[in-house]
């Protein structure tokens, strides 16, 4: 297969970093990280016609170049620039769904509503979803033992910088009405420190984006509160309004029914509020 050819061609031995080396507070690189990234790239480019011309070997070269031989607390957005370029993807800019602290439901939604896209529905997001990776300074080794934790070690680590970079670009590409799914079960429904709150909100382009529409997802079945009145949602509205983007908010009281109605909009029970 194409994947075997790639590994045959490069014959890279991915050694674990010896245990006596720097110990970080976070989990180490996901096992079989290079193979996983390449396999995901091949799969994605086979399924998505607009990305079929992308060379997965070059994508992997760009990915590893971003963090191999570099100190895992000193990664910059510039390190990821080649990967970002190769992963440039034209998604319908008016069909973007952002999310914060509610990834699974957002992904379930775009699996049904196929014309909408989360970041993880793009090549770069798909490659890295749920993976961890880091290297170490001046060696070509991948560290499978431990990687820096954002809070306990450093924020400029390979994983955090990657998601900050792709999230910024994803938000910059959005236009018209942008949707965001927020978790109404959390104490901070909108969290300024989340990727959405710290990166995406500030990189929506007012000249292209007309409205940000928040969908607040309720957790409890009997929860009939209007969570759009939550102070953190009001804070989000204020930030967005100051950026000359309109804001709207909807409560999704029954996420299970919401998904069902996306699948079957003709269902008679789908006319009532969900």
């Amino acid at each position: 297969s194409g994947l075997n050819d790639i590994f045959e061609a490069q014959k890279i031995e991915w050694h674990e970093v010896p245990r006596w080396r720097q110990q970080w507070s976070g989990p180490g690189t996901t096992k079989r990280f290079p193979e996983t990234v390449l396999a995901r790239c091949v799969k994605y480019t086979e399924i998505h016609p607009e990305m079929r011309h992308v060379d997965c070997q070059s994508v992997w070269d760009a990915f590893k170049g971003a963090f191999i031989s570099k100190h895992p607390c000193n990664i910059t957005e510039e390190d990821y620039q080649p990967l970002m370029k190769l992963g440039t993807q034209t998604v319908p800019c008016n069909k973007i769904l952002l999310w914060s602290r509610i990834k699974d439901l957002a992904h379930q939604f775009t699996q049904v509503q196929r014309d909408m896209f989360t970041l993880e529905d793009t090549l770069l997001g798909y490659l890295a979803d749920d993976l961890t990776w880091c290297g170490e300074f001046n060696t070509s080794k991948i560290n499978y033992q431990s990687c820096p934790d954002w809070r306990k070690d450093c924020s400029n680590n390979p994983v955090s910088v990657f998601w900050k970079t792709v999230s910024r670009r994803f938000a910059e590409a959005a236009c018209d009405v942008v949707h965001v799914m927020l978790n109404g079960s959390r104490s901070k429904i909108f969290d300024k420190n989340s990727t959405f709150g710290s990166v995406e909100v500030h990189n929506l382009q007012p000249e292209k984006v007309q409205t940000l529409e928040a969908w607040v997802i309720h957790g409890g079945r009997e929860d009939s509160r209007d969570l759009c009145q939550d102070p953190t949602i009001k804070e989000l509205e204020s930030i967005i309004s100051k950026r000359n983007i309109q804001f709207s908010c909807k409560n999704i009281y029954r996420p299970d029914k919401f998904l069902q109605c996306v699948k079957n909009p003709e269902d008679s029970s789908c006319t009532s509020e969900i």
Partner: antibody, heavy 121, light 110 residues
């Protein structure tokens, strides 16, 4: 001052090979994408290949150029190369190298160009 | 394959005229606005005029302006000057970092 200077063009028989060079000066070579673009006589522009070398070489090609054309870079000489094999009459063109604007808001655009080198097949 | 179609292919104008060139892409450009315009004079390399559809490149006179998004874009010269008679190319940026150029519009003296 940013300068790009192409060389290596000339007359070649169909099926032959040629290596073009693009010598760069006046900027930090490793921090920019260098793109090869060609223009057939009296025709429009067409991109060929791109290369970036922050640590290792990262390169990619227009679909039509894959297999026949290879881009490479010698950082010590501040030079990018375009190796062209199995040349055909339709490859006759002026070949330019260009530097892409840097920064993610500007990628995808070419701010500095060489004067071009003519390849005749 | 991505196609960028420019119209008209040739345009005759007098000094002071307002000129508009259209560029249509067969696919939406990256970010809805990742399109550039270049000016090329005979025997010379192209020169960047506009980027991101409507941003003027450094040193380009303000009589040049750009607009459009998605698949349809225009370059306007509000009042053509003698130095503006040249060929103009649009260029889009697409998935996977691919580039495509339009076929060109030659602006000649009437």
């Amino acid at each position: 001052e940013v300068q790009l200077l192409e060389s290596g063009g000339g007359l070649v028989q169909p099926g032959g090979s040629l290596r073009l060079s693009c010598a760069a000066s006046g900027f930090s070579f490793n921090n920019y994408w260098i793109i090869w673009i060609r223009q057939a006589p009296g025709k429009g522009l067409e991109w060929v290949a791109a290369i970036y070398s922050p640590s290792g070489d990262i390169k990619y090609y227009a679909d039509w150029a894959k297999g026949r054309f290879t881009v490479s870079k010698d950082n010590s000489k501040n030079t990018v190369y375009l190796q062209m094999n199995s040349l055909r009459a339709e490859d006759t063109a002026v070949y330019y190298c260009a530097r892409e604007l840097s920064g993610s808001s500007y990628e995808g655009y070419f701010e500095s160009w060489g004067q071009g080198t003519l390849v005749t097949v | 394959d991505i196609q960028l179609t420019q119209s008209p292919s040739t345009l005759s104008a007098s000094v002071g005229d307002r000129v508009t060139i259209t560029c249509r892409s067969s696919q939406s450009v990256y970010g809805h606005n990742w399109l550039a315009w270049y000016q090329q004079k005979p025997g010379k390399a192209p020169k960047l005029l506009m980027y991101r559809a409507s941003n003027l490149a450094s040193g380009v006179p303000s009589r040049f302006s750009g607009s459009g998004s998605g698949t349809e874009f225009t370059l306007t010269i509000s009042s053509v000057q003698p130095d503006d008679f040249a060929t103009y190319y649009c260029q889009g940026y697409y998935s996977g970092g691919a580039y495509a150029f339009g076929g060109g519009t030659k602006v000649e003296i009437k």
